[in-house]
């Protein structure tokens, strides 16, 4: 009987663990290339897929171009941004490019915005080469509160690689705040 009880307790424990894991918030958002904005300086990317291809979201919300935290916790945030130019893509006005990504946190309760992560480089993409490519990956561990919003800003959005395996960002909760 004691062994049976232990088995039942164990299975309940597994179930509780599993349901807790299933409730763990996460998001992986991929660029919606049909709606990339204009600009050359810092431009906010507001159009992302959350439910097609590799894109998925659970217990977080995507609204108005921002990823909204629904549960307090420590989260791992990441972003991968690829820039590319091919001689058939369009006409480059300059070879000198600042290719940057900024991951920003906005708090609604106390209206404020903070850059959590940034990455990138200045590049010289000469016309002597028919193809140019540059990738940026940033990631970090942050304490986030419910209602806080994560957004992505980039420079030179017209040079973004529109593939789902190239330009994406996401988050997953690692643990509760004690």
């Amino acid at each position: 009987i004691r062994a049976e009880k232990a088995m039942v307790d164990g299975s309940w424990l597994d179930l509780a663990k599993r349901s807790k894991l299933e409730a763990q918030p996460f998001a992986h958002l991929t660029i919606n290339a049909t709606d990339i904005p204009s600009g050359s300086h810092k431009v906010s990317l507001s159009s992302w897929y959350h439910d097609r291809g590799w894109a998925k979201i659970s217990n977080m919300t995507f609204s108005n171009g921002k990823l909204i935290v629904n549960q307090d916790g420590f989260y791992y945030l990441y972003a991968n941004i690829c820039f590319r130019h091919h001689e058939t893509s369009g006409d480059l006005a300059t070879e000198y490019l600042q290719l940057m990504v900024y991951v920003t946190k906005t708090s609604i309760k106390i209206p404020s915005s903070h850059t959590l992560m940034k990455g990138g480089s200045t590049k010289y993409w000469s016309g002597n080469s028919e193809f140019h490519f540059y990738s940026i990956n940033v990631g970090g561990f942050f304490k986030l509160r419910s209602g806080e919003e994560i957004s992505i800003e980039v420079s030179n959005p017209s040079l973004l690689d529109p593939d789902q395996d190239a330009t994406y960002f996401g988050a997953f909760k690692v643990r509760d705040i004690d």
Epitope: S38, S40, E95, N156, S158
Partner: antibody, heavy 121, light 107 residues
């Protein structure tokens, strides 16, 4: 003050050649892509050529490709347009224009005063 | 090539009036449309870019709107000095193309 001043316009016979110049001042010339835009006698505007800030990319519409060559000398803050095999339909006021905006989607934010090219026998 | 069509070659208006000039693209150009003003005997001047952004120093009576294929340029209260030809231009792709121009006459 940002200024673009074109020169070199003239009366030339069909099949002839001409070189236009554009002197830039009041801004860091080497940071900007530049273009030539022409205005025909019926007042239509037509993009003619573009060169990137460092000079390694050049672009032309089909109407002038192979006949016109855009170039620049960043040390002299000067833009050029070498025109050859000129046709009567090349008769126009030629403007030098600075590019603004961003890659692939640039527009013309500053225009010069223009120089007149007349192709006639 | 993308064709930009300004249906009105001439438009007549009075000082203080609101006037709108339209421009239609032969295919989707997103919001990549610029508007230029050319006064008699002068070179063109940029007023609006990316459909709705006013260029530096342009008075706020000039506005632009639209996306896709249909674009509008509006002067909210026409002044005597606004007598000019107004051109739209797509800056979506090359070759860059212009509309035929709309000549604004002041009554």
């Amino acid at each position: 003050e940002v200024q673009l001043v074109e020169s070199g316009g003239d009366l030339v016979k069909p099949g002839g050649s001409l070189k236009l110049s554009c002197a830039a001042s009041g801004f860091t010339f080497s940071r900007y892509g530049m273009s030539w835009v022409r205005q025909t006698p019926d007042k239509r505007l037509e993009w003619v050529a573009t060169i990137s800030s460092g000079g390694s990319y050049t672009y032309y519409p089909d109407s002038v490709k192979g006949r016109f060559t855009i170039s620049r000398d960043n040390a002299k803050n000067t833009l050029y347009l070498q025109m050859s095999s000129l046709k009567s339909e090349d008769t126009a006021m030629y403007y030098c224009a600075r590019l603004d905006g961003y890659n692939y989607r640039w527009y013309f934010d500053v225009w010069g005063t223009g120089t007149t090219v007349t192709v006639s026998s | 090539d993308i064709v930009m069509t300004q249906s009105h070659k001439f438009m007549s208006t009075s000082v203080g009036d609101r006037v709108s000039i339209t421009c239609k693209a032969s295919q989707d150009v997103s919001s990549a449309v610029a508007w230029y003003q050319q006064k008699p005997g002068q070179s063109p001047k940029l007023l609006i870019y990316s459909a709705s952004y006013r260029y530096t120093g342009v008075p706020d009576r000039f506005t632009g709107s639209g996306s896709g294929t249909d674009f509008t340029f509006t002067i909210s209260s026409v002044q005597a000095e606004d007598l000019a030809v107004y051109y739209c231009q797509q800056h979506y792709s090359s070759p860059r193309t212009f509309g035929g121009g709309t000549n604004l006459e002041i009554k």
